[in-house]
């Protein structure tokens, strides 16, 4: 903590301005009134404070607002946002997208993924749901940030908003997030024709169940290997060799390269070697000819 001292009369601060950059840490602590700072936060970002001086200003605001800053202050944090921890941000209530935009701009180029994720979470909570305007803001100012939200938060996305999500916004989404988003996307794009539907649904397919993947295999979609590799392992394992062949179309030629990677490797282990050989791609590791396949999981369930 900064040592408390009395402010010399000649150093008393009546407004936040550039003269403060010449103040030592202890002078800032003693002479800047927290309420004045909060009222004139919009001036702070224009002043080239050092990181040490910003630490003092943050400390002032923390003392003034132990329960979390009001949005009027948050909106004008500017580079002071770089000093915030996820724990600080968790106390905030943010509803304005202007605030979100301002802070996303500040965080660009800095290692602040945890802080940004927490900020976005607070915005979604503050606004009540992940509405179209919020999604538009995220895709414009923070590609990939959508995936920083928990599955619980993502469940508040209305299907009507899904159309605003671009493929690159889902690049960092995990299986649990795609499990939530896929049904919404399926609903959002249900009235589209075959090829148009596939183009739209493709980025969400990491959340698709087996029956939907099987259905796609009957539609001449020509799924690329990158998309196939992102499918859920559980969705791929029940597919037959013929279904995978139909699903991938001309991309079936790429299976050999992915032979050692999941889910292709796991799928190969479940196929008869005879069936794999019909592809003519040299895939190895299938069930040898003449072997019986016993599904022990069924026995266990019945015993």
């Amino acid at each position: 903590d900064v040592e408390r001292t009395t402010c010399p009369p000649e150093k008393e601060v009546h407004e936040i301005d550039e003269s403060l950059i010449f103040y030592k840490k202890r002078e800032l602590e003693a002479c800047v009134d927290a309420a004045l700072l909060a009222a004139q936060m919009d001036r702070v970002d224009a002043i080239p404070f050092t990181y040490e001086q910003l630490d003092v200003l943050k400390h002032k605001l923390d003392e003034l607002y132990p329960q979390g800053y009001p949005e009027s202050v948050i909106r004008h944090l500017g580079h002071l946002f770089l000093k915030m921890s996820p724990e600080d941000i968790r106390k905030w209530n943010v509803t304005s997208l202007e605030t979100l935009k301002a802070l996303l701009k500040v965080s660009k180029g800095h290692e602040m993924s945890a802080q940004v994720a927490t900020l976005i979470d607070r915005v979604v909570v503050g606004r009540g749901q992940l509405d179209k305007d919020t999604v538009d803001t995220l895709t414009a100012f923070c590609p990939g940030c959508l995936c920083s939200l928990s599955p619980e938060r993502l469940s508040s996305v209305p299907p009507s908003v899904i159309g605003a999500v671009r493929p690159q916004d889902l690049d960092t989404c995990g299986p649990r997030q795609l499990d939530v988003l896929y049904p919404k996307a399926r609903l959002a794009f249900q009235n589209m024709s075959g090829s148009e539907y596939f183009v739209k649904i493709r980025p969400f397919l990491g959340g698709a169940p087996t029956e939907d993947v099987k259905a796609l295999s009957q539609q001449n979609v020509s799924m690329d290997l990158a998309t196939f590799m992102k499918l859920r392992r559980e969705a791929v394992l029940p597919l037959t060799v013929a279904e995978v062949q139909k699903l991938l179309g001309p991309h079936v030629e790429g299976l050999k390269v992915e032979e050692q990677h999941s889910p292709v490797r796991d799928w190969i282990l479940k196929q008869r070697q005879d069936d794999l050989d019909t592809l003519g791609l040299g895939l190895q590791g299938g069930i040898p000819n003449g072997y019986l396949i016993l599904d022990l999981s069924v026995r266990e369930a019945l015993s």
Epitope: N220, S222, D224, G249, P250, H251, V252, E253, G254, K256, Q273, L276, D277, T278, L279, G280, L281, G282, L283, Q284
Partner: antibody, heavy 116, light 107 residues
Framework: EVQLVESGGGLVQPGGSLRLSCAAT????????MHWVRQGPGKGLVWVSR????????VYADSVKGRFTISRDNAKNTLHLQMNSLRAEDTAVYYC?????????WGQGTLVTVSS | DIQMTQSPSSLSASVGDRVTITCRAS??????LTWYQRKPEKAPKSLIY???SLQSGVPSRFSGSGSGTDFTLTISSLQPEDFATYYC?????????FGQGAKLEIK
């Protein structure tokens, strides 16, 4: 290392026969489809024939149908092309190649010259 | 049979140039197209499959695009080892057919 080595080429008179072979090493031969492709002097690549993994399915270009027969011996890792009723236009370098619709490995070829 | 027509049949370019070779199919082949590179006395090497997917180990300066009947192979910045003959081939249906080739020479 994958290797395909063709043999059996040579000079033959029109109407004659020739049997080309392709010895495969460095991979599980019985799991791959195999092809024959040829290239005539000063000409482009022309696909000739394809055989599936176990030899039960074969396809031919119209120009060789009824005259050429593709076969394989998975026990010996060898691909064959039996060429009968040869014509001058069959003169080419013949390549065996591994792959499904795309040929990912090729041999260096064997020259077949049909001339009287 | 599906005819494959390449253009140009030959072209001259310099190291660092961006080069485009086109291939046209006589009927719709979807994305069932591959591009090969062939150097003198060497076996053809598959660069691209499914019209736009890069084969493993192929430099990213090579890219493919198109679907249906019109396809393009692009080399973004020519390297000395890229001077060769390039062939397209359809694998939508038998007989498999190749383009006549495009010879890329040093200017």
């Amino acid at each position: 290392e994958v290797q395909l080595v063709e043999s059996g080429g040579g000079l033959v008179q029109p109407g004659g026969s020739l049997r080309l072979s392709c010895a495969a090493t460095g991979f599980t031969f019985s799991s791959y489809w195999m092809h024959w492709v040829r290239q005539g002097p000063g000409k482009g690549l022309v696909w000739v024939s394809r055989i599936n993994s176990d030899g039960t399915s074969t396809v031919y270009a119209d120009s060789v149908k009824g005259r050429f027969t593709i076969s394989r011996d998975n026990a010996k890792n060898t691909l064959h092309l039996q060429m009968n009723s040869l014509r001058a236009e069959d003169t080419a370098v013949y390549y065996c190649a591994r792959g499904r619709g795309i040929m990912t490995y090729w041999g260096q070829g064997t020259l077949v010259t049909v001339s009287s | 049979d599906i005819q494959m027509t390449q253009s140009p049949s030959s072209l001259s370019a310099s190291v660092g140039d961006r080069v485009t070779i086109t291939c046209r199919a006589s009927q719709d082949i979807g994305s069932w197209l591959t591009w090969y590179q062939r150097k003198p006395e060497k076996a053809p090497k598959s660069l691209i499959y499914a019209a736009s997917s890069l084969q493993s180990g192929v430099p990213s300066r090579f890219s493919g695009s198109g679907s249906g009947t019109d396809f393009t192979l692009t080399i973004s910045s020519l390297q000395p080892e890229d001077f060769a003959t390039y062939y397209c081939q359809q694998y939508k249906s038998y007989p498999l057919t190749f383009g006549q080739g495009a010879k890329l020479e040093i200017k």
